[in-house]
């Protein structure tokens, strides 16, 4: 008796144990997108970056969707999001057009049910790059701690696209849940 | 024959908790890890910096390993990683041999198993820091969520080491375990 | 006897999980404040912003307190840090009293046991804003990992606090609890 | 080989002015930063002004500050030194050095010129 | 600024001897930025070391130099007879660069 019900019990707190890693694991969805350079479009308007990497290099995705230019929200939670964006020029890609540039970033969070987009962070700088330097660079980083629910669309706006650094380790976002909503 | 069922199964679930409590805090590894200016190298060129504080101030690790100037991952697992660099100069630093500085990190991972290294972010920007101003700064911040197996390596390069901000606030990077690999 | 035993258990593994969800939750603080633009003080120096939202649009609070423009602890823990802080100032604003600014965020952290203030992480840049220029913005994002104690108070010092970005998605800082203290 | 070749002293009066050069070859002048370094008779070492690669930033020590100028012709790969209100304690041979540029920060004088000599009396 | 006071004024050795040339800092040496040169009658110095104790191209090893802080020495295993000159220690880790008044090592 005592002995198949301890069993029994192992048995149990098994799969249970199971369930809860399992379950962990999730509610744990995250993304990691690079930079699909093939793709950037050129003009120095804001514009949406639609191509993204979501599976190769450091790329990579779970319980998340990437779908049309847009990471989607597959479970309700509080996420960290994050954005690195790197712009840079040689002047072997020709000369600016002008020097006074505005290098920016925002990370908007659309909702179909009620189609409205809202920038959730924003980050940048104006700069002066001057034709006495042959080579300029500059990063942007934000990050911040969000509720998203289900079906919500994460997207990435800049500036000056065709001055966007092309590399995995320069031009990427993500994200990763961090707890589920009360 | 209930009670006693009851009292055991208290017992074994309480274990249970303890057991999950402990593991849910092995399996988060983490480490802050400050510049520690005495060691700094000079020169202008991309130079790994191999002198971190991991015990005192701000800084701290738990496990990870910090060995050879490296943050080195004891647990599979996904982590978000970070570095915030900070350079500075003020004119009785000495005269800038030139106002057109790059000011860059490199967040690298190496693995021992097939050696190699690779820029897993990088961030930073062209200054024009002119003599006619008494003090510069600027700060680069990085962060990015990435798969971590054990025995890989992670390192910090900068341009310019000479010119780092040697608090424990301004220069510094690290690492925190967010979920395990499926 | 069998069957009776399964349904308790049952019941008290149902229970458990309630509790490990219920306590899984509760273990994870957060806040997510985003600037007050009523009440931001003016001048170049460096200054406590003390008036920030935390329940309208991105802005939330959970298990933590926000009081006289702290955030404060309520659990001890490992928290993620960050802080988003936007500066920009447009012609039609005035002219700027210098070209060279220093613009800086200091995130602070103060124990009320031992009265005492310490920088966890710095971030910023010195710029040339030239008249030429009708319009300026720079952004600066620090984040880190840091150990909290219960009723320590986490608060943000900026220089230049005329010339912050009032909007949510600009200057805003937060935190999210990782992990409990050994 | 670099070579560093400095002209242009001589005696003048107190008051006076001068204008000192020095012709750089065998390196890409303009990647480098340069200095003027000088000593007295029987003296020792005084740095006494340097300019950064692009000419934009220029750097001088107390003692010559408001009366001397620095500059550089990158076409010409040639440095100068302007002095004017020129004293009696500023009579020293003059060296053009050649910043090393392994550094951002002006640092070690290597090589120098075989300097020229200023002498500053009535 | 940083004042740098060599010591002794004068050395005399014999060839083949070792010199050991101190230079002080008023105030600490950032990041070993410390260089020594070498001047003969009638010539322009020449760099021996810089950062302290990395030997410049072309000099022989006999040279040396070390310390950080305050304090800093040039040493010369074994002095040949071309050696003889003065020396003089140069700092660049704060404006103005400065040099020390000179050490001559004379021989005896």
């Known amino acids: 008796g005592s002995q198949h019900i301890r069993a029994e019990k192992a048995m149990v707190d098994g799969s249970w144990l199971d369930l809860a890693k399992r379950s962990k694991l999730e509610a744990q969805p995250f993304a990691h997108l690079t930079i699909n350079a093939t793709d950037i479009p050129s003009g120095s308007h804001k514009v949406s970056l639609s191509s993204w990497y979501h599976d190769r290099g450091w790329a990579k995705i779970s319980n998340m969707t990437f779908s049309n230019g847009k990471l989607i929200v597959n479970q309700d939670g509080f996420y960290y999001l994050y954005a690195n964006i790197c712009f840079r020029h040689h002047e072997t890609s020709g000369d600016l057009a002008t020097e006074y540039l505005q290098l920016m970033v925002y990370v908007t969070k659309t909702s179909i049910k009620i189609p409205s987009s809202h920038t959730l962070m924003k980050g940048g700088s104006t700069k002066y790059w001057s034709g006495n330097s042959e080579f300029h660079f500059y990063s942007i980083n934000v990050g911040g701690f969000f509720k998203l629910r289900s079906g919500e669309e994460i997207s990435i706006e800049v500036s000056n696209p065709s001055l966007l650094d092309p590399d995995q380790d320069a031009t990427y976002f993500g994200a990763f849940k961090v707890r589920d909503i009360d | 024959g209930s009670q006693h069922i009851r009292a055991e199964k208290a017992m074994v679930d309480g274990s249970w908790l303890d057991l999950a409590k402990r593991s849910k805090l092995e399996a988060q590894p983490f480490a802050h890890l400050t510049i520690n200016a005495t060691d700094i190298p000079s020169g202008s060129h991309k130079v790994s910096l191999s002198s971190w504080y991991h015990d005192r101030g701000w800084a701290k690790i738990s496990n990870m390993t910090f060995s050879n100037g490296k943050l080195i991952v004891n647990q599979d697992g996904f982590y978000y990683l970070y570095a915030n660099i900070c350079f500075r100069h003020h004119e009785t630093s000495g005269d800038l041999a030139t106002e057109y500085l790059q000011l860059m990190v490199y967040v690298t991972k190496t693995s021992i198993k097939i050696p190699s290294s690779h820029t897993l972010m990088k961030g930073g920007s062209t200054k024009y820091w002119s003599g006619n101003s008494e003090f510069h700064f600027y700060s680069i911040n990085v962060g990015g969520f990435f798969k971590l197996r054990s025995g890989e390596e992670i390192s910090i390069e900068v341009s310019n080491p000479s010119l780092l901000d040697p608090d424990q606030d301004a220069t510094y990077f690290g690492a925190f375990k967010v979920r395990d690999i499926d | 006897g069998s069957q009776h035993i399964r349904a308790e258990k049952a019941m008290v593994d149902g229970s458990w999980l309630d509790l490990a969800k219920r306590s899984k939750l509760e273990a994870q603080p957060f806040a997510h404040l985003t600037i007050n633009a009523t009440d931001i003080p003016s001048g170049s120096h460096k200054v406590s912003l003390s008036s920030w939202y935390h329940d309208r649009g991105w802005a939330k609070i959970s298990n933590m307190t926000f009081s006289n423009g702290k955030l404060i602890v309520n659990q001890d823990g490992f928290y993620y840090l960050y802080a988003n802080i936007c500066f920009r100032h447009h012609e039609t604003s005035g002219d700027l009293a210098t070209e060279y600014l220093q613009l800086m965020v200091y995130v602070t952290k103060t124990s009320i046991k031992i009265p005492s203030s310490h920088t966890l992480m710095k971030g910023g840049s010195t710029k040339y804003w030239s008249g030429n220029s009708e319009f300026h913005f720079y952004s600066i994002n620090v984040g880190g990992f840091f150990k909290l104690r219960s009723g320590e108070e986490i608060s943000i010092e900026v220089s230049n606090p005329s010339l912050l970005d009032p909007d949510q998605d600009a200057t805003y800082f937060g935190a999210f609890k990782v992990r409990d203290i050994d | 080989e670099v070579q560093l070749l400095e002209s242009g002293g001589g005696l003048v009066q107190p008051g006076g002015s001068l204008r000192l050069s020095c012709a750089a070859s065998?390196?890409?002048?303009?990647?480098?930063?340069m200095s003027w370094v000088r000593q007295a008779p029987g003296k020792g070492l005084e740095w006494v002004s340097g300019?950064?690669?692009?000419?934009?930033?220029?750097y001088y020590a107390d003692s010559v500050k408001g009366r001397f100028t620095i500059s550089r012709d990158n076409s010409k790969n040639t440095l100068y030194l302007q002095m004017n209100s020129l004293r009696a304690e500023d009579t020293a041979v003059y060296y053009c050095?050649?910043?090393?540029?392994?550094?951002?920060?002006?640092?070690?004088?290597?090589?120098w010129g075989q300097g020229t000599l200023v002498t500053v009396s009535s | 600024e940083i004042v740098l006071t060599q010591s002794p004024g004068t050395l005399s050795l014999s060839p083949g001897e070792r010199a050991t040339l101190s230079c002080r800092a008023s105030q600490s040496v950032r990041g070993r930025y410390l260089a020594w040169y070498q001047q003969k009658p009638g010539q322009a110095p020449r760099l021996l070391i810089y950062g302290s104790s990395s030997r410049a191209t072309g000099i022989p090893d006999r040279f040396s130099g070390s310390g950080s802080g305050t304090d800093f020495t040039l040493t010369i295993s074994r002095l040949e007879p071309e050696d003889f000159a003065v020396f003089y220690c140069q700092q660049y880790g704060s404006s103005p660069r400065t040099f020390g008044q000179g050490t001559k090592v004379e021989i005896k």
């Open positions: 300019i950064t690669g692009s000419g934009g930033s220029t």
């Open positions: 050095a050649k910043d090393p540029g392994t550094t951002v920060i002006m640092s070690w004088f290597d090589p």
């Open positions: 065998g390196f890409t002048f303009s990647s480098y930063a």
